[in-house]
């Protein structure tokens, strides 16, 4: 992507108070692959609702259904994971609500309640009734898919019976699971038929299989663990903003840039300019000028207002947002028409978004 020769510095600067940004973590909706997911846009009095995913406009297709304030995803896949937003457009303003969708082979956090009820899982058999292993409490095994935040404790259970009493061993991704395979090892509570891993990390992700066997047979059950990481991310800009605009000479125009950031964002409005009659510096990079940036003396940095425009104001306007993690930018074009031509809002063109990883 291009670098720029700056007429003014576009580095990190002191930021304005965070009054307008959704800085807290968005709500997370989790689904397993193949499941359907329905989310309601939690905004009131919405005349028109538009949806985006990772900053890109989301339209209906064979798997995505948009009905009123509801978004339905049919047959979810991991590629449906991401940051979603619904924007409610009203006559006077608009509001955006963000949420995360996580489609993984893991639908809920681990069963980490105390093993107070574990004793009934240990079934004693009449010594004469020889029996291959069997599950004694399948309810505790129904949840095969576990999505657990990093640093949490995970417990997998395989309550079983049999005669003679079966033994239990654990595999990770089909191979013997050894203590040295993870920092801090793990605990096996044979009395409760459980495997316990404390303070899970991303490398703990995978399939965990309990193998329960005696001389009369063997049974197994596999759980899938996904470790959900938490870390701050760079800004995300709402798709389609700023929008292309046109006005007549002497008219006024506004560009709007909607920002989502979980770390305080710094907003800059930048325009390509000429210096000494040239648009490019000696290094071949375009000259840019910072027109406005968030800071103490700057009101509502998400909006760039241009008054009494001239033909020289025509061109590309870039909304550049940074926090200490990273940057994002999107741009729009201003067309300045001669006085006799009536201005019209151009069809919005979405600039290429700055994708998250």
């Amino acid at each position: 992507r291009p670098s720029f020769s700056l007429v003014e510095d576009t580095t990190l600067e002191p930021e304005e108070p965070p009054t307008k940004y959704q800085i807290s973590q968005p709500e997370v909706y989790v689904a397993a692959p193949g499941e359907s997911l329905e989310v309601r846009c939690l905004l009131k009095d919405a005349a028109v609702i538009s949806w985006t995913k990772d900053g890109v406009h989301l339209g209906p297709n064979n798997r995505t259904v948009l009905i009123g304030e509801y978004l339905q995803i049919k047959g979810a896949t991991p590629r449906d994971s991401g940051l979603y937003a619904c924007t409610a457009s009203r006559t006077v303003d608009s509001e955006t609500w963000y949420f995360m969708v996580n489609v993984t082979d893991a639908i809920s956090s681990g069963d980490d309640e105390d093993d107070t009820d574990g004793a009934e899982d240990f079934v004693s058999e009449n010594s004469n009734n020889k029996r291959a292993p069997y599950w004694t409490n399948t309810e505790k095994m129904e949840k095969r898919l576990h999505a657990v935040p990093a640093a949490n404790t995970v417990k997998f259970r395989c309550p079983a019976g049999g005669n003679p009493m079966p033994t239990m061993r654990w595999l990770k991704n089909g191979k013997e699971f050894k203590q040295e395979h993870r920092i801090g090892g793990y605990k096996v509570r044979n009395q409760h038929w459980s495997l316990i891993m404390e303070s899970v990390v991303p490398s703990d992700k995978g399939n965990y299989t309990c193998v329960v066997e005696n001389e009369y047979g063997s049974i197994n059950h596999t759980y899938h663990l996904d470790v959900v990481e938490r870390s701050p991310h760079r800004p995300i800009l709402q798709a389609g903003l700023p929008a292309n605009a046109s006005t007549v000479v002497g008219g006024d125009v506004e560009f709007v840039c909607k920002v989502y950031s979980d770390a305080q964002p710094h907003i800059q409005w930048i325009k390509h300019v000429e210096k000494n009659g040239s648009k490019y510096g000696p290094d071949g990079l375009p000259y840019l000028k910072v027109l406005k940036h968030s800071g103490i003396n700057s009101s509502n940095a998400e909006v760039l207002a241009l008054f009494n425009v001239t033909e020289a104001d025509a061109g590309e306007y870039i909304c550049k947002v940074s926090n200490y993690i990273g940057q994002a930018n999107q741009s729009a074009w201003l067309t300045v028409l001669p006085k006799q031509q009536a201005p019209g809002r151009e069809k919005e063109i979405t600039a290429s978004p700055d994708y998250l990883e």
Epitope: R1, F4, T11, P14, S231, D262, A263, Y324
Partner: antibody, heavy 113, light 107 residues
Framework: QVQLVQSGAEVKKPGASVKVSCKAS????????IHWVRQAPGQGLEWMGA????????SYNQRFKVRATLTADTSTSTVYMELSSLRSEDTAVYYC??????WGQGTTVTVSS | DIQMTQSPSSLSASVGDRVTITCGAS??????LNWYQRKPGKAPKLLIY???NLADGVPSRFSGSGSGTDYTLTISSLQPEDFATYYC?????????FGGGTKLEIK
Amino acid sequence: QVQLVQSGAEVKKPGASVKVSCKASGYIFTNYYIHWVRQAPGQGLEWMGAIYPDNGDTSYNQRFKVRATLTADTSTSTVYMELSSLRSEDTAVYYCARAFTYWGQGTTVTVSS
Amino acid sequence: DIQMTQSPSSLSASVGDRVTITCGASENIYGALNWYQRKPGKAPKLLIYGATNLADGVPSRFSGSGSGTDYTLTISSLQPEDFATYYCQNVLSTPYTFGGGTKLEIK
């Protein structure tokens, strides 16, 4: 997984320059600021500056603006921090960090005549 | 520049204790505060970001709170591996200043 590997320890004379490298892997290099932080013996942590590899944007602590230069080579996913006009008080451990979440192992720079 | 002031500068505690470290900013930093743990010879480790959010791989006994100019790091039940030096950091505006550190020692 995310890794930041820094170059080895350096011993320099006062007035000289030092260039410390930080090679990143395990993530999209251009998507995150790389910050530089140092800690002198018996002192606290001090932020020196940051660079955004995607476009080369830099931001410096005014204390280092004249003497420090941050550069990024996207072809090798490596960031460099050069500090010039070294003095004895620049003796410190220098760290690179991806957005303060992942840190390099540190590079000890000793300035001594 | 925003000044960050940590207290206490050192603290003695026992395994199992509840420990609180405070950090004050010279001006409102609007929750833009990180907490780090640093052990001798090791790089700092991010514990809390945005004043209250637990970072990856950090045990839930660590928690952060506060707003405006006053922030707190709490360790609910000290573990042997928690003895280290803790730093707060302003991430609102450059320069991203750190507090002077709190050295947590075994009593």
